[in-house]
């Protein structure tokens, strides 16, 4: 069986992670969706997760984590603002179903965050426009305590770092042998 | 097959403004990031800022910060890109880009992967 | 902001040669980086995608390859049609980043 792909993001501390993962627009719209880590060895662990149902172009924000789901385009937002050193690691997009297994979105994605070039502030927005401005209506969603019943079979590529995860945290499985089919317009 | 059309050529005065405009046919437009990249004659590309329509945030190179702002229209799948307090350095061939990237996580996967044909801007008292 | 530095920045070949192009970007930036042909008059093409994809109707006589900092572009036989100018550009982050060009020109 073929392994997850990932595709792998190199940014400075204070920069932004901003990524989509799509989605079956039919199937998932108004599904609750989850921003996850995976650490080696471990279960995927829940970072921030949106409303359920989730609501449309409505930002949820936990931490330094921006989730907003547009269900007219089958994509959830992702963003990571003013990412630190320890942010760096492996992450998934998934989609709560229960009873059945959470639904991963491709690709995992991953973050590696390096300490910005010495005598130059950290951020990237000295260089580009302040865009990722966090929305001032932002609500915090609860994520549900969800564990699979599944066991992890093999543990995923080693991440570089842990991440701080909000209280609401939790357990799901690690999903594999999936693989990523590019889709051409 | 998306394609990406622009506005017709523009002379304008030192200190002006000028608003080149990129229309989208053939595909989604909302998800695209559209980049604009200008060439001086001589010069190589240059990258000056994008947009994601359906965010309605833009991005903008430090050179142009303050001078360029990208908008875009969704309702007419329409961006645009102005540049103010016009000098002679700013003469250029002005092209518009789509950067894609369906059943990936990044919104520019596949690059800058279609090109408006260029708007070509003279400035010159 | 990330810079990219091609080189060389001029290069002389004959139709048949194999041709490579470098890119050097100043930081790591994984496989976001895409290579471009532009010929006077005209918008530029893309070539190449993620590093290593060939773009649909590229011919497949160009081809990438690198990851991180280093990346290269090669054209196997070159075609007269091939003459131009040829541009990398990272999009990891923003503000995206060109290359300053190589041009390719007849010997």
């Known amino acids: 069986a073929t392994k997850l792909t990932e595709e792998k993001y190199e940014l400075k501390e204070g920069q932004t992670l901003d990524v989509k993962c799509d989605y079956t627009l039919e199937k998932f719209a108004s599904s609750q969706k989850a921003w996850q880590i995976i650490r080696d060895g471990e279960m995927p662990k829940t970072l921030a997760c949106t409303e359920r149902p989730s609501k449309n172009s409505h930002p949820v924000q936990v931490g330094r984590i921006i989730l907003e789901d547009y269900h007219d385009h089958g994509l959830l937002r992702v963003r990571m603002v003013n990412l630190q050193v320890e942010d760096s690691g492996l992450y998934q997009c998934v989609i709560y179903q229960p009873p059945k297994e959470p639904h991963m979105l491709f690709d995992r994605i991953r973050l590696v965050v390096t300490k910005g070039f010495s005598g130059t502030p950290g951020s990237n927005e000295n260089s580009t426009q302040n865009v990722y401005k966090i929305p001032p209506t932002t609500t915090k969603a609860l994520c549900p305590l969800y564990t699979s019943p599944r066991t992890v079979t093999q543990a995923p590529p080693k991440s570089t770092a842990d991440v701080s995860t909000p209280d609401s945290e939790i357990n799901l499985t690690n999903v594999t042998d999936i693989i990523r089919v590019p889709v051409f317009n | 097959q998306v394609q990406l059309v622009q506005s017709g050529a523009e002379v304008k005065r030192p200190g002006s403004s000028v608003k080149v405009s990129c229309k989208a046919s053939?595909?989604?437009?909302?998800?695209?990031?559209i980049s604009w990249v200008r060439q001086a004659p001589g010069q190589g590309l240059e990258w000056m800022g994008g947009?994601?329509?359906?965010?309605?945030?833009?991005n903008y190179a430090q050179k142009f910060q303050g001078r360029v702002t990208i908008t875009a229209d969704e309702s007419t799948n329409t961006a645009y890109m102005e540049l103010s307090s016009l000098r002679s350095e700013d003469t250029a061939v002005y092209y518009c880009?789509?950067?894609?990237?369906?059943?990936?996580?990044?919104?520019?996967?596949?690059?800058?992967?279609?090109w408006g044909q260029g708007t070509t801007v003279t400035v010159s008292s | 902001d990330i810079q990219m530095t091609q080189s060389p920045t001029s290069l002389s070949a004959s139709v048949g040669d194999r041709v490579t192009i470098t890119c050097r970007a100043s930081?790591?930036?994984?496989?976001?980086l895409a290579w471009y042909q532009h010929k006077p008059g005209k918008a530029p093409k893309s070539l190449i995608y993620?590093?290593?994809s060939l773009q649909s109707g590229v011919p497949s006589r160009f081809s990438g390859s690198g990851s991180g900092t280093d990346f290269t572009l090669t054209i196997s036989s070159l075609q007269p049609e091939d003459f131009a100018t040829y541009y990398c550009?990272?999009?990891?982050?923003?503000?995206?980043?060109f290359g300053q060009g190589t041009k390719l020109e007849i010997k």
């Open positions: 880009a789509r950067g894609h990237g369906p059943g990936s996580s990044h919104y520019s996967y596949y690059g800058l992967d279609v």
């Open positions: 053939g595909g989604t437009f909302s998800i695209y990031v």
């Open positions: 947009i994601i329509p359906l965010f309605g945030t833009a």
């Open positions: 930081q790591g930036i994984s496989s976001w």
């Open positions: 993620a590093a290593s």
């Open positions: 550009q990272q999009y990891n982050s923003y503000p995206y980043t």
